[in-house]
Amino acid sequence: FNMDTRKPRVIPGSRTAFFGYTVQQHDISGNKWLVVGAPLETNGYQKTGDVYKCPVIHGNCTKLNLGRVTLSNVSERKDNMRLGLSLATNPKDNSFLACSPLWSHECGSSYYTTGMCSRVNSNFRFSKTVAPALQRCQTYMDIVIVLDGSNSIYPWVEVQHFLINILKKFYIGPGQIQVGVVQYGEDVVHEFHLNDYRSVKDVVEAASHIEQRGGTETRTAFGIEFARSEAFQKGGRKGAKKVMIVITDGESHDSPDLEKVIQQSERDNVTRYAVAVLGYYNRRGINPETFLNEIKYIASDPDDKHFFNVTDEAALKDIVDALGDRIFSLEGTNKNETSFGLEMSQTGFSSHVVEDGVLLGAVGAYDWNGAVLKETSAGKVIPLRESYLKEFPEELKNHGAYLGYTVTSVVSSRQGRVYVAGAPRFNHTGKVILFTMHNNRSLTIHQAMRGQQIGSYFGSEITSVDIDGDGVTDVLLVGAPMYFNEGRERGKVYVYELRQNLFVYNGTLKDSHSYQNARFGSSIASVRDLNQDSYNDVVVGAPLEDNHAGAIYIFHGFRGSILKTPKQRITASELATGLQYFGCSIHGQLDLNEDGLIDLAVGALGNAVILWSRPVVQINASLHFEPS
């Protein structure tokens, strides 16, 4: 109707990076920018994705290099993390959130795709990492190996081989395992501290240079106490599981101290594995019963999990696998191993800023049934799996509903702010829920809408619209972009109007009657008043229209509702040649060229497009007859 299609600003970017997948208008002290997501952007050797800031009038885009942001204390994998897949602007302070839902980190032998987001302040500086689903690895362990190096240990090389082989089984790295080694006889020494080495390679190299220190006495209690009171302190990490491995070949010369030493280890929650090497006893034909009892006393209960004995030093190699497996069986404690909580949650697949924080869709949470998490300045709220059961019953738990594919919120005069999330795969037809979140990790689900057609992806896009700008939501629009009709993937946008406390279905928006795939409703944007009639408007994207060139539809708001026939359809082909997937993202909240009119930003494959609004001239005709 009044969007200019003759002089758009087409901002080019990388097609392979999918520059344009997301777009947001941005204002810094009166300077206007587009923030553009490129989720397949490369940083060095990794396809991390990234975000660009693009000047509105002229000039080139600048990469923000958010793909280089690293989280300390985790072994992260940023390749294919899809940074920029979702963007959310906070209009209060003009900061924004850029999410990497496929960001993952190494935990033992697994990679957990928890997702993470970067908060960027109004002047495009990274300020904070938001990763509410990130949990400590079960391999977040500080392991101290307490080695008997007294004279009776022979040959030392076998002890060294054992040490190297067990170290090779450990997942050493940030956020995972740290290893320290102490050697004792009459005295105790640090061979290396917990935080001296950060990789298996470095630890193994250090271990290969440990020499036997000797000693006529075996002060095992002192060695254990030294490990507890010193080795776990020097480089030890708060919250890390403390594991001690004691390897000795004889009764201790300070066994009367063991009771107190073990009590203190218990108090410090140190899990103790103890290995009795019987070489000295077997070589001399001595009964090892007293020795074995002592080693069992040192080992944590139950003995069958924590105590080992080997016939001699050479046999140490035979327990490497068993010891490693027992240590890592700590990983799965009290866990149903076939089930995922937040480990694969893909948090940040969608994002939405609310007054007290940000909502993040986590489609992979709870075995891909999905969830919505909330991060606030006061902490995070992660609803329990059970809190969704009312609308996502147990019998459908293996269907992968993908709740959190999109998130938004509505405001009703009675209930205040209510959150909205889409689950486009729920029972194959899709579902949208409206809910409030509580600090005790429960939800109250107020309403649910269900899709009609299998595979339509109902709920993959949701937008709330305050038509008259009174602060209360008037309309909720739900996209089902894969809705199949007349032999094609046409797409559909459902209209729900707020009546008292409930949203009531009120038809669908009309698209064009072309006979190709369109995916109408892939993106739906609530935009500020485009046609200067004081009602806010809606723009819907159909990125597959015109043979994947794409198109957008502009619908005008009117008296608390929305007019279901588009006032303007803009196709990619009328703007520039070569545009593809035009309409995959839309944002329209700012006047970008200072003419007093709201302008549109539209994403395409490898491009961001700015469409300028033109003024609307209201002509009021009045007839005067003279003489009357």
Epitope: E217, F222, E225, S252, D254, D257, L258
Partner: antibody
């Protein structure tokens, strides 16, 4: 030759204090444990306290807990028993003895004993 | 705490007699049980350690044995210098808490 010599005994009034010493020779105190054992006139042996000079861990009999303190000075190769709030029933001959790995945790060497009399 | 109950509290025997003294532990204990001999006005002397091992310099007529929670000191042929009081002592495992029996006085018949 291994030797333990106690000193510091004597007459003390109830509520008073006394410090007993046990000087060791012929071995290092920090490779063993020292125990104090007492014997009241005409009675049997009663264990009082022990210390590991190396780790400084201590143990006490319930009858003396909170009143007696065992300590050791490895540089002087001497153990001590500080006795406070003494009572008539603490009257006894006090022996120190060595306890270590090589005697399979038995008291293999004893001092000659020192008499402590608590009386008003 | 473990109690050591020693019996008998006294016995009369003649030179050449076989003498047996028993200590019963109130609960299952390790073999860290020792036996001492004490003569009037003297410090105790170690005879047996680890329930059955003879301490160096101690005559072989002294022996120790264990059966469950019962520990026995045997003097195979009593000699005049053996008239004394005998004590058993138990070491609590992995601590230096020790307990003595009440003692057995061996007198000349």
């Amino acid at each position: 030759e291994v030797q333990l010599v106690e000193s510091g005994g004597g007459l003390v009034q109830p509520g008073g204090s006394l410090r007993l010493s046990c000087a060791a020779s012929g071995f290092n105190l920090d490779s063993s444990y020292i125990h104090w054992v007492r014997q009241a006139p005409g009675k049997g042996l009663e264990w009082v306290a022990s210390i590991s000079s190396y780790s400084s861990y201590t143990y006490y009999a319930d009858s003396v807990k909170g009143r007696f303190t065992i300590s050791a000075d490895t540089s002087k190769n001497t153990a001590y028993l500080q006795m406070n709030s003494l009572r008539a029933e603490d009257t006894a001959v006090y022996y120190c003895a060595r306890y270590w790995y090589y005697s399979a945790w038995a008291l293999d060497y004893w001092g000659q004993g020192t008499l402590v009399t608590v009386s008003s | 705490d473990i109690q050591m109950t020693q019996s008998p509290s006294s016995l009369s025997a003649s030179v050449g007699d076989r003498v047996t003294i028993t200590c019963r532990a109130s609960q299952s204990v390790s073999s860290a049980v020792a036996w001492y001999q004490q003569k009037p006005g003297k410090a105790p002397k170690l005879l047996i350690y680890s329930a059955s091992s003879l301490y160096s310099g101690v005559p072989s007529r002294f022996s120790g044995s264990r059966s469950g929670t019962d520990f026995t000191l045997t003097i195979s042929s009593l000699q005049p210098e053996d008239f004394a009081t005998y004590y058993c002592q138990q070491s609590a495992p992995y601590s230096s808490l020790i307990t003595f029996g009440q003692g057995t006085k061996v007198e000349i018949k």
